[in-house]
């Protein structure tokens, strides 16, 4: 993830981003790019916009991509069928 600034909610981030938990410091949230093709994801990551405070360090996948299971407990952003 690219650090683009601290945040609390999605509304504080630019387009194509969400306010996700920092990989490095769990108490901090940072504006993080939405998942690209091949990125790891979680299928229950809240869609953008989310008005609460996220718990995951990943954002949802970009439009046109879906968070799909590739093996047990592993999910990746892939093109929607």
């Amino acid at each position: 993830a690219v650090i683009t600034g601290a945040c609390d909610k999605d509304s504080q981030c630019g387009g194509g981003m969400c306010c996700a938990v920092s990989i490095w410091v769990k108490s901090i949230r940072i504006c993080t790019p939405m998942g690209k093709l091949g990125d790891s994801c979680h299928p229950l990551t809240r869609k953008v916009p989310f008005f609460g405070r996220r718990m995951h360090h990943t954002c949802p996948c970009l439009p046109g991509l879906a968070c799909l299971r590739t093996s047990f407990n592993r999910f990746i952003c892939l093109a929607q069928k």
Epitope: V21, K26, H42, P43, L44, T45, R46, K47, P49, F50, F51, G52, R53, R54, M55, H56, H57, N73
Partner: antibody, heavy 121, light 111 residues
Framework: EVQLVQSGAEVKKPGASVKVSCKAS????????MHWVRQAPGQGLEWIGY????????TYNQKFKGRVTITVDKSTSTAYLELSSLRSEDTAVYYC??????????????WGQGTLVTVSS | DIVMTQSPDSLAVSLGERATINCKAS??????????MNWYQQKPGQPPKLLIY???NLESGVPDRFSGSGSGTDFTLTISSLQAEDVAVYYC?????????FGQGTKVEIK
Amino acid sequence: EVQLVQSGAEVKKPGASVKVSCKASGYSFTDYDMHWVRQAPGQGLEWIGYISCYNGATTYNQKFKGRVTITVDKSTSTAYLELSSLRSEDTAVYYCARDANYGEAYAMDYWGQGTLVTVSS
Amino acid sequence: DIVMTQSPDSLAVSLGERATINCKASQSVDYDGDSYMNWYQQKPGQPPKLLIYAASNLESGVPDRFSGSGSGTDFTLTISSLQAEDVAVYYCQQINEDPFTFGQGTKVEIK
């Protein structure tokens, strides 16, 4: 004060459809998702699905896929559950419940009073 | 689907004593260091009430005699000192994978 007020009890014949409403008040309706859960008489809880009250996006329990439709009317702050092709096993109390917005820890912090749907020939 | 199994099915505890309810998931409900497990209380004729979210976080307004613990597949709800108003059915719920599934419930009564 957050309140979820559901429509009244329904009696339906097998094969029919039912639509239950849930009117929300006391908070910003579009900022929270709404879940639907049911409870058969004397039984446990079963999650049906939820909807984003912001953009109408839905996630359903696959068990109900094709028979259930969850919608919202933002103008009246009301969520709806429609269940079709009813069978006797659908006899239950149906609850709407607001998502608590605790990040990805989906949790239901306010519940409607429940709507009893009875399916009987 | 993830199957949630609670034990015991029912529990009789003296007033002021500790009550412990267990919940076992058929697979891990952890993700990214968090446990995606909730606990609810339901009294007769009422809707459920959220007690604990994300395994160990006490919902606002819930007495601190309630606590949740556990990770992975094994979770516990503890009532440190049972009060008369705690007589109810308690449900665990996993929210790590759709469909969100509940345990079958544990009935807590006064001995």
